[in-house]
Amino acid sequence: KRFHDVLGNERPSAYMREHNQLNGWSSDENDWNEKLYPVWKRGDMRWKNSWKGGRVQAVLTSDSPALVGSNITFVVNLVFPRCQKEDANGNIVYEKNCRNEAGLSADPYVYNWTAWSEDSDGENGTGQSHHNVFPDGKPFPHHPGWRRWNFVYVFHTLGQYFQKLGRCSVRVSVNTANVTLGPQLMEVTVYRRHGRAYVPIAQVKDVYVVTDQIPVFVTMSQKNDRNSSDETFLKDLPITFDVLIHDPSHFLNYSTINYKWSFGDNTGLFVSINHTVNHTYVLNGTFSLNLTVKAAAPGPCPPPPPPPPRPPKPTPSLGPAGDNPLGLSEIPDENCQINRYGHFQATITIVEGILEVNIIQTTDVLMLVPGPDSSLIDFVVTCQGSIPTEVCTIISDPTCEITQNAVCSPVDVDEMCLLTVRRAFNGSGTYCVNLTLGDDTSLALTSTLISVPDRDPASSLRMANSGGGGLNDIFEAQKIEWHEHHHHHHHHH
């Protein structure tokens, strides 16, 4: 059998291999050692017994899409049946105190490979033997601790294969410089050690994509915006656009990246080298946002110009044809740069919203029949922008972290946007008050610290930022400026 007979449904063409030469990979026309690595078709009854206690699942993931020329990394993780795990020696053991259908196991081992490998007859003293080889006969690499690696992974794509000895998780990186653009298929077959041979335990496949477009994502955020994912934002407040470039192999690390923005509101083009930009829309409506990212990245060198055509020679003496009969143009081993582009387009809607909220006055309310532990305080609030439809107050500890009470209620506010919010405080002390005004599209927040005095008639009201004062005194509460923080990870700058 050949590798393509074992690993794929169809024999890949030589054309596919020639057009996608992967460094360090081998042609799937090579012979497969079926004696050492038996081949079972899908549905073969032997799969049922390929693993003690159930089936092993292989999960294949990649960091696709990959910009052509960059590395793409594939990770295979083996998921064992319930209660099974790989130990430090590479043996498969039952987890302690874990109960599966078979109950608790007396034997701690599912597979004790250490014991098997110590029985090392047939080896020639170097640790090399006829069974420590891959399906194509190549010997296992003798890394430190290689004996604890009991799984053989065979990766197959584009008519080529790559063999790897590993534990329950392996990763393989492939350079995509010679890979045809578009979606491709990666298939992985996993074998486990079984005495002096191997047994297939899992097969998995996944599509990956190679592209010449920089994969670009943009996050959009705005203070007071109620829902950042609906692409509806508020007029007269800056929107922060943050560009994330998917470049897990850091291919573009040394590239100069330019960001060209068109916000769709006739403000022209804005070119920046910063991945973050702020823009304020001053009109309501729907706008088409366009971003072009440009990076000078390592790329193929253009072929040298062809020599001038020679006049036909009278003698038909052809030179040796063996070297390069197909004229496969060589790509010089130079560091050429090529401009790569990425694009992002979004339609965003701009609406009125609550732009700002301020507490302008805080008043202790005199109660005719004071409760033993209760104080009422009125907050006089103003806002700018659209008219709020609800108000929420969150009362918490002085650090503003532990919520003690949260109340939301509808409000009916006139055009002046002046309202009084009355809230009860249980007991004396310092409180953090978060006050939020909201409508359909926006939420505006302000915070203040307030000090509620003892109800002891002898004591006077204490404020957060002042000395004493009478019960009816009006005081300015200490303001806490509040900003929503967005944390992003970037590969660049």
Partner: antibody, heavy 119, light 107 residues
Framework: QVQLVQSGAEVKKPGASVKVSCKAS????????MHWVRQAPGQGLEWMGE????????NYAQKFQGRVTMTVDKSTSTVYMELSSLRSEDTAVYYC????????????WGQGTLVTVSS | DIVMTQSPDSLAVSLGERATINCKTS??????LAWYQQKPGQPPKLLIY???YRYTGVPDRFSGSGSGTDFTLTISSLQAEDVAVYYC?????????FGGGTKVEIK
């Protein structure tokens, strides 16, 4: 939809060169190899070579090696095939054809360009 | 180079009857073989790729079969519009090569 539009018919003298263009639209130009296939009057199809618009790698059939040059203009999504030292047996319809991913079968063809070599 | 031998050179079949065209390759190209239909003054049109896969929009009276070095294109019930020249092409390796063509006519 995918379209390959070729340049018009040419009449050339023996020994001259001809440059045929093939303008692609309706797909990502750099993602697919472009091939050239010719057909002499009343004869079968003959593959001449291919070019990758992304990196301008080329493969030419041995028969045309040294006489054919395939080039790309990415800005206009156009592929060119230049054949030099023309002789009468080069009289043919020249087609550009787009391969599909890693498979060299041709679902999309240009309309063809007749090149006549005559003294 | 892989040599493609197509047979017969021409074929006359009654309307509604079966037409069979063969293509033999000088080495194993399985399953990388395509079939095309060409009418006068037009570029070829892809019918079958990878031996047996019918291309989008191709009527199901066209089918491809075979493996290794022997392949067949079958038109199960010949229609008037099927009159054309049919070519096989190996897409296994470069240089890509075509068969000499089979002319299908109505008897």
């Amino acid at each position: 939809q995918v379209q390959l539009v070729q340049s018009g018919a040419e009449v050339k003298k023996p020994g001259a060169s001809v440059k045929v263009s093939c303008k692609a639209s309706g797909y990502t130009f750099t993602s697919y190899w472009m091939h050239w296939v010719r057909q002499a009057p009343g004869q079968g199809l003959e593959w001449m070579g291919e070019i990758n618009p992304y990196d301008q790698r080329t493969n030419y059939a041995q028969k045309f090696q040294g006489r054919v040059t395939m080039t790309v203009d990415k800005s206009t999504s156009t592929v060119y095939m230049e054949l030099s030292s023309l002789r009468s047996e080069d009289t043919a319809v020249y087609y550009c054809a787009r391969s599909t991913g890693n498979y060299a079968w041709f679902a999309y063809w240009g309309q063809g360009t007749l090149v006549t070599v005559s003294s | 180079d892989i040599v493609m031998t197509q047979s017969p050179d021409s074929l006359a079949v009654s309307l509604g009857e079966r037409a069979t065209i063969n293509c033999k390759t000088s080495q194993d190209v399985s399953p990388s073989l395509a079939w095309y239909q060409q009418k006068p003054g037009q570029p070829p049109k892809l019918l079958i790729y990878s031996g047996s896969y019918r291309y989008t929009g191709v009527p199901d009276r066209f089918s491809g079969s075979g493996s290794g070095t022997d392949f067949t294109l079958t038109i199960s019930s010949l229609q008037a519009e099927d009159v054309a020249v049919y070519y096989c092409q190996q897409h296994y390796s470069i240089p890509l090569t075509f068969g000499g063509g089979t002319k299908v006519e109505i008897k």
